[in-house]
């Protein structure tokens, strides 16, 4: 039994880091493998993660962490029974994938303006809370070419757009994702999408 693709890990910078790897053949990850992880600190404990299958030869493990600070560094040991298959380390702050925003809502009752709001996925005491920026994706269910991205570079989790920038009388969907420049993170997953029917009063033409 050998590791074909070494574990790569990302952290949500709150409580979970996710590590993925591939074995050289079909593997029952949960029965055959264990990933041990330990904070590099005099008084830390080793923790065991039981991996799940992620495709035939792929494995994924969700490492639970109390909290994360930028200096944290973890040792990782991948075991198959008594055999050490791989040894490495992981610094969560250098491999951050933020949590996806939630509760995306489209408010259509503001006159001729669409207000999109969502929730910051972090609590106020988390470092990322004040460092997230967002991308909002809006697309038409009827027209695949009607697909747009709005970059929200301010901290407030909301976006206002004129309803008239979208076509009237058709359904749209929106979703949002987050990233943090301070840690050069990857983008989060997209939030669940939300749907609304776009309608607005066309302005009277002046002759």
């Amino acid at each position: 039994m050998k590791v074909l693709q070494e574990p790569t890990c990302v952290s949500d910078y709150m409580s979970i880091s996710t590590c993925e790897w591939k074995m050289n053949g079909p593997t029952n990850c949960s029965t055959e493998l264990r990933l041990l992880y330990q904070l590099v600190f005099l008084l830390s404990e080793a923790h065991t993660c039981i991996p799940e299958n992620n495709g035939g030869a792929g494995c994924v493990c969700h490492l639970l962490m109390d909290d994360v600070v930028s200096a944290d560094n973890y040792t990782l040991d991948l075991w198959a029974g008594q055999q050490l298959l791989w040894k490495g380390s992981f610094k969560p702050s250098e491999h951050v994938k933020p949590r996806a925003p939630g509760n995306l809502t489209v408010h259509t009752n503001v006159s001729d303006t669409l207000l999109l709001t969502w929730s910051n996925p972090y609590p106020p005491d988390n470092y990322l809370y004040n460092h997230l920026t967002y991308a909002v994706n809006i697309w038409s269910e009827n027209d695949p070419a009607d697909f747009r991205i709005y970059n929200v570079t301010y901290l407030e989790p909301s976006l206002r757009i004129a309803a008239s920038t979208l076509k009237s009388g058709i359904s749209y969907r929106a979703r949002v994702r987050a990233w943090a420049q301070c840690y050069n993170t990857t983008w989060s997953e997209w939030s669940p999408s939300t749907k609304w029917h776009n309608s607005y009063r066309e302005p009277f033409e002046q002759h």
């Epitope: 830390s44 404990e45 200096a71 944290d72």
Partner: antibody
Framework: EVQLLESGGGLVQPGGSLRLSCAAS????????MSWVRQAPGKGLEWVSA????????YYADSVKGRFTISRDNSKNTLHLQMNSLRAEDTAVYYC??????????????WGQGTLVTVSS | QSVLTQPPSASGTPGQRVTISCSGS????????VSWYQQLPGTAPKLLIY???KRPSGVPDRFSGSKSGTSASLAISGLRSEDEADYYC???????????FGGGTKLTVL
């Protein structure tokens, strides 16, 4: 409310032994590293010993190494310090404290009221 | 001799602002966070400031902490008689693999 309550201090002769205990409540004891910090009369604070949340990792200051033994019973939410071959310079108030959890943000966030250990003939 | 250096004493009159310094090195304060502890006469130490400048709930905002390079300081504004106590700084030391304290500063409110 987090509470740490030390017991077991007293007067002991040089070369003697004493066992300190610290009863913890108000938090999940098994999630935290725990420490003993002492303060000699009129002096400053000294980190004496510590034990990781599960008991697998232990620290001793050079001044007590080989004489003191720290242990914990997570089922009873209790921390212990067995002190052997006591010397006059071990005379101090011994505090039980919660932490530290990691190096970069190391802190003792809760302290007990302390128990006085006097080593004298 | 303590690893972290504090002035042995400081004083001020009620309402005044006083500052207590804590000097270390790259292996402790330079690389790790600083905490401050208050020890009122005859009582156990209590956490006053952690992560250089954060206050635990219940600690008045008259107390503030800061860090620059290998030094840290504790500032107390609007000094009160009940602030008379010993104040200790503390930090992890990477070289010693140990938590180290300053020698303590006795604050007198005149």
């Amino acid at each position: 409310e987090v509470q740490l309550l030390e017991s077991g201090g007293g007067l002991v002769q040089p070369g003697g032994s004493l066992r300190l205990s610290c009863a913890a409540s108000g938090f999940t004891f098994s999630d935290y590293a725990m420490s003993w910090v002492r303060q000699a009369p009129g002096k400053g604070l000294e980190w004496v010993s510590a034990i990781s949340s599960g008991g697998s990792s232990i620290y001793y200051a050079d001044s007590v190494k080989g004489r003191f033994t720290i242990s914990r019973d997570n089922s009873k939410n209790t921390l212990h310090l067995q002190m052997n071959s006591l010397r006059a310079e071990d005379t101090a108030v011994y505090y039980c404290a919660r932490g530290p959890q990691r190096s970069a943000t190391a802190v003792f966030d809760y302290w007990g009221q302390g128990t006085l250990v006097t080593v004298s003939s | 001799q303590s690893v972290l250096t504090q002035p042995p004493s400081a004083s001020g009159t009620p309402g005044q602002r006083v500052t207590i310094s804590c000097s270390g090195s790259s292996s402790n304060i330079g690389n790790n966070n600083v905490s401050w502890y208050q020890q009122l006469p005859g009582t156990a130490p209590k956490l006053l400031i952690y992560a250089n400048s954060k206050r635990p709930s219940g600690v008045p905002d008259r107390f503030s902490g800061s860090k620059s390079g290998t030094s840290a300081s504790l500032a107390i504004s609007g000094l009160r008689s009940e602030d008379e106590a010993d104040y200790y700084c503390g930090s992890w030391d990477d070289s010693l693999s140990a938590y180290v304290f300053g020698g303590g500063t006795k604050l007198t409110v005149l």
